[in-house]
C-alpha cells in the first residue's frame, strides 16, 4: 500500500529544546490507520488516526531532536482482508534543522 506523506508542521522549533511536530498522512482511502514514527530506524511514537481522518500529528517533546540516529520516517498500517495487518512503505525522510526556515 502507498507510502504516507510526512511533513514538519507549525509551530516550528527554533532550538533543540523546542518540541517538534510531525504530521504523517495516508492516502484518503485509508482513514483511521495506525501510524508509527521512526527516527534512525527506531520507533519513536505510535498513534491511531480517528476513523474519519487520514493522518496524525506526532508531538515530540523538547530535546527529542538530540536523540542519536538519522532522519524521521513514518509508516501506517491498516487491517486488510481476513483481518490481516498491512503495512505501508516508509515515507520519504524529513530532517529537522534549527531554525526551520519560514517563507
Amino acid at each position: 500500500i502507498p507510502a504516507p506523506s510526512i511533513r514538519l508542521v507549525p509551530p516550528y522549533p527554533s532550538s533543540q529544546e523546542d518540541p517538534i511536530h510531525i504530521a504523517c498522512m495516508a492516502p484518503g482511502n485509508f482513514p483511521g490507520a495506525n501510524f508509527t514514527l521512526y527516527r534512525g530506524g527506531q520507533v519513536v511514537q505510535l498513534l491511531q488516526a480517528p476513523t474519519d481522518q487520514r493522518g496524525v500529528t506526532f508531538n515530540l517533546s523538547g530535546g527529542s531532536s538530540k536523540a542519536p540516529g538519522g532522519p524521521f520516517h513514518c509508516q501506517y498500517g491498516v487491517l486488510g482482508e481476513l483481518n490481516q495487518s498491512q503495512l505501508s512503505d516508509l515515507s520519504e525522510p524529513v530532517n529537522v534543522s534549527f531554525p526551520v526556515p519560514t517563507w
Epitope: S5, R7, V9, A23, M25, D52, Q53, R54, E92, W103
Partner: antibody
Framework: EVQLVETGGGLIQPGRSLRLSCVAS????????MHWVRQAPGKELEWVAV????????QYAYSVKGRFTISRDNSKNTLYLEMNILGPEDTAVYFC???????????????WGQGTTVTVSS | DIQMTQSPSSLSTSVGDSVTITCRSS??????LSWFQHKPGKAPNLLIY???SLQSGVPSRFSGSGSGTDFTLTISSLQPEDFATYYC?????????FGPGTKVEIK
C-alpha cells in the same frame, strides 16, 4: 453525500459588513478544518482563510487580515465568514471548502460548496 | 507567497485525445500539490492530491505526477464531461495558492 451549502451573499455597499454562512452535512464537521476560498470575476482562485477543527487556530490571507473573521459553530455544523470594511476588490464568488480528512490546514482541501456571490458596489 | 504557473492557459482538443497540463511552483513544495476540475456554476472537484494520489470516485483516466517544483496532470482519453477548467494548488505553505487555470475546450 458530503455537502457544503454557502449562503449570505448579495449586493452590498462599500464600507459595509456581511456575514457568510456554510452549512455542512453528511460528515463529522467537528473533525475537519475548514477554509474559505474566493474567485473574483475573471480572476484566479484566492485562498482567504482557514480555521482548525476545534476553532483554536485561524489563519488569513494578507488581503483580508484585520477585516475578515473566520469562525465556526460545531454544534450547528456551520462555518462563518464575517467580512468588514468591504471594498470592490472583495467582489467574488466565495466557496466554503473542507479540509482533506484532517483537523488542520496542512491536510489540504477536498470537498467544495457551489459558492455564494458577493458584489460590492455603490 | 509561493507562485503557481500553469501551461497551457487553454487548449482545444477532441474526445478520445490525451491531454497533459503542467504546473510549476516558484519553490519546492515536495508533493503537496492538488489538481481540481471546475465547471461554471458548479463546485470545484478534487481530482488528484499529494501530486499523484487519485481521489476516491475519480476516473482512472486522470493521473498526476511530479515533485519539488514541476508537476503534471494527464487525462489519458478525454471524455465529453472532461471539458472544464483545471487548477493546480499547493498546500505546503500558507497562504495556499492556485495556478491561473487551464481551460480545456472542444475543438
Amino acid at each position: 453525500e458530503v455537502q457544503l451549502v454557502e449562503t449570505g451573499g448579495g449586493l452590498i455597499q462599500p464600507g459595509r459588513s456581511l456575514r457568510l454562512s456554510c452549512v455542512a452535512s453528511d460528515f463529522r464537521f467537528s473533525n475537519h478544518a475548514m477554509h474559505w476560498v474566493r474567485q473574483a470575476p475573471g480572476k484566479e482562485l484566492e485562498w482567504v482563510a482557514v480555521i482548525s477543527s476545534d476553532g483554536s487556530n485561524r489563519q488569513y490571507a494578507y488581503s483580508v487580515k484585520g477585516r475578515f473573521t473566520i469562525s465556526r459553530d460545531n454544534s450547528k455544523n456551520t462555518l462563518y465568514l464575517e467580512m468588514n470594511i468591504l471594498g470592490p476588490e472583495d467582489t467574488a464568488v466565495y466557496f466554503c471548502v473542507r479540509s482533506h480528512l484532517g483537523p488542520e490546514w496542512y491536510y489540504g482541501m477536498d470537498v467544495w460548496g457551489q459558492g455564494t456571490t458577493v458584489t460590492v458596489s455603490s | 507567497d509561493i507562485q503557481m504557473t500553469q501551461s497551457p492557459s487553454s487548449l482545444s482538443t477532441s474526445v478520445g485525445d490525451s491531454v497533459t497540463i503542467t504546473c510549476r511552483s516558484s519553490q519546492s513544495i515536495s508533493t503537496f500539490l492538488s489538481w481540481f476540475q471546475h465547471k461554471p456554476g458548479k463546485a470545484p472537484n478534487l481530482l488528484i492530491y499529494d501530486a499523484s494520489s487519485l481521489q476516491s470516485g475519480v476516473p482512472s483516466r486522470f493521473s498526476g505526477s511530479g515533485s519539488g517544483t514541476d508537476f503534471t496532470l494527464t487525462i489519458s482519453s478525454l471524455q465529453p464531461e472532461d471539458f472544464a477548467t483545471y487548477y493546480c494548488q499547493q498546500s505546503d505553505y500558507l497562504p495556499f495558492t492556485f495556478g491561473p487555470g487551464t481551460k480545456v475546450e472542444i475543438k
